[in-house]
């Protein structure tokens, strides 16, 4: 028969022969022959391969380096890599999460729109009219100005995006 030029799914062409790929979690030891199946071996401890493959070496699991603020979110298996995330108060600098940085704080005049996670930084937003933030915080939202009226008080000093209004007693001299 004519030697094949293409092979089925989960096969590869080597020396005019279609051989089975190794399943995820296993590496290639030796190509198949007309008489012998492809030789595959399981990946070792702390190694993985996540696809049907003909790799002769497994990949090392990612190391979540605590010196870079990393910790293990999900332990790797022979078929999956380790997933790292950042320690509390830190977030990944990239999608691959190879290092961490401290969550950013929102400056006075800005409030937290979205609290940071292990993989995303704090999202700040400017405090709109009627709201303020007088602290630098990674958690605090913009607070509404105090309503002097509900306390039977009057505004003595207008609020800003960084300060609350100052309420004071009503002017008793006014009729």
């Amino acid at each position: 028969p004519e030697p094949p030029t293409a092979c089925r799914e989960k096969q590869y062409l080597i020396n005019s022969q279609c051989c089975s790929l190794c399943q995820p979690g296993q590496k290639l030891v030796s190509d198949c022959t007309e008489f012998t199946e492809t030789e595959c071996l399981p990946c070792g401890e702390s190694e993985f391969l996540d696809t049907w493959n003909r790799e002769t070496h497994c990949h090392q699991h990612k190391y979540c380096d605590p010196n870079l603020g990393l910790r293990v979110q999900q332990k790797g298996t022979s078929e999956t890599d380790t997933i790292c995330t950042c320690e509390e108060g830190w977030h990944c600098t990239s999608e691959a999460c190879e290092s961490c940085v401290l969550h950013r704080s929102c400056s006075p005049g800005f409030g937290v729109k979205q609290i940071a996670t292990g993989v995303s930084d704090t999202i700040c937003e400017p405090c709109p009219v009627g709201f303020f933030s007088n602290v630098s915080s990674a958690f605090e939202k913009c607070h509404p100005w105090t309503s002097c009226e509900t306390k039977d008080l009057v505004v003595q000093q207008a609020g800003t995006n960084k300060t609350d209004v100052v309420c004071g007693p009503q002017d008793r001299l006014r009729a």
């Epitope: 020396n15 030796s30 022959t33 007309e34 008489f35 012998t36 199946e37 030789e39």
Partner: antibody
């Protein structure tokens, strides 16, 4: 560890039969093709036969075709060589060997077959 | 059928010397599927080199294979006492039959 152990050799008269066995251990026998290779006293290596891992394909050297039959029992991890109509020139040490794309990578220790009247 | 011719038939050398063994094929060996085997008296052959140049597991790096097509060489850079043996080349691409060379005996001078 990976091992092949041949048995069944001995002294036999010309025209008679003998069956050799090769017991495999330490690897997934049912995934590998297997060979018989022989070596006459003081001579070189001569390939005898090969069998596919499922037993579906068999090839023989011209010198044994029609007289020898290679077979296997994967449930017993054993390879066989049925030798009929034996001749003096079949006298040799018979080795079983594992087939890979690296060649014959594992060999048994061999079993001696002597054909003599 | 591919015929493999090995030379020399016997090589007389001293420990520490370099050994060069030749294997010539009557036609090109497909994919360089050529192996070298070592055999000591009373023992089974042992795979040394496959694919013409790749050392098998556990084989010391003083053994090296080279060549392609029809001309192949096994080199032992510095002979150790345990290296004195018979060496066979064998091809495993064009079959049947699988063929072996006649062997080269490396003996102590």
């Amino acid at each position: 560890q990976v091992q092949l152990v041949e048995s069944g050799g001995g002294v036999v008269q010309p025209g008679r039969s003998l069956r050799l066995s090769c017991a495999a251990s330490g690897f997934t026998f049912e995934k590998y093709g297997m060979h018989w290779v022989r070596q006459a006293p003081g001579k070189g290596l001569e390939w005898v036969a090969v069998i596919h891992y499922e037993g579906s394909i068999k090839y023989y050297a011209d010198s044994v075709k029609g007289r020898f039959t290679i077979s296997r029992d994967n449930s017993k991890n054993t390879l066989y060589l049925q030798m009929n109509s034996l001749r003096a020139e079949d006298t040799a040490v018979y080795y079983c060997a594992r087939d890979t794309s690296r060649g014959h990578d594992i060999w048994g220790q061999g079993t001696m077959v002597t054909v003599s009247s | 059928e591919i015929v493999l011719t090995q030379s020399p038939g016997t090589l007389s050398l001293s420990p520490g010397e370099r050994a060069t063994l030749s294997c010539r094929a009557s036609q090109s060996v497909s994919y360089d599927y050529l192996a070298w085997y070592q055999q000591k008296p009373g023992q089974a052959p042992r795979l040394l080199i496959y694919g013409a140049s790749t050392r098998a597991n556990g084989i010391p790096d003083r053994f090296s294979g080279s060549g392609s097509g029809t001309d192949f060489t096994l080199t032992i850079s510095r002979l150790e006492p345990e290296d004195f043996a018979v060496y066979y080349c064998g091809e495993y691409a064009d079959y049947p039959p699988f063929t072996f060379g006649g062997g080269t005996k490396v003996e102590i001078k």
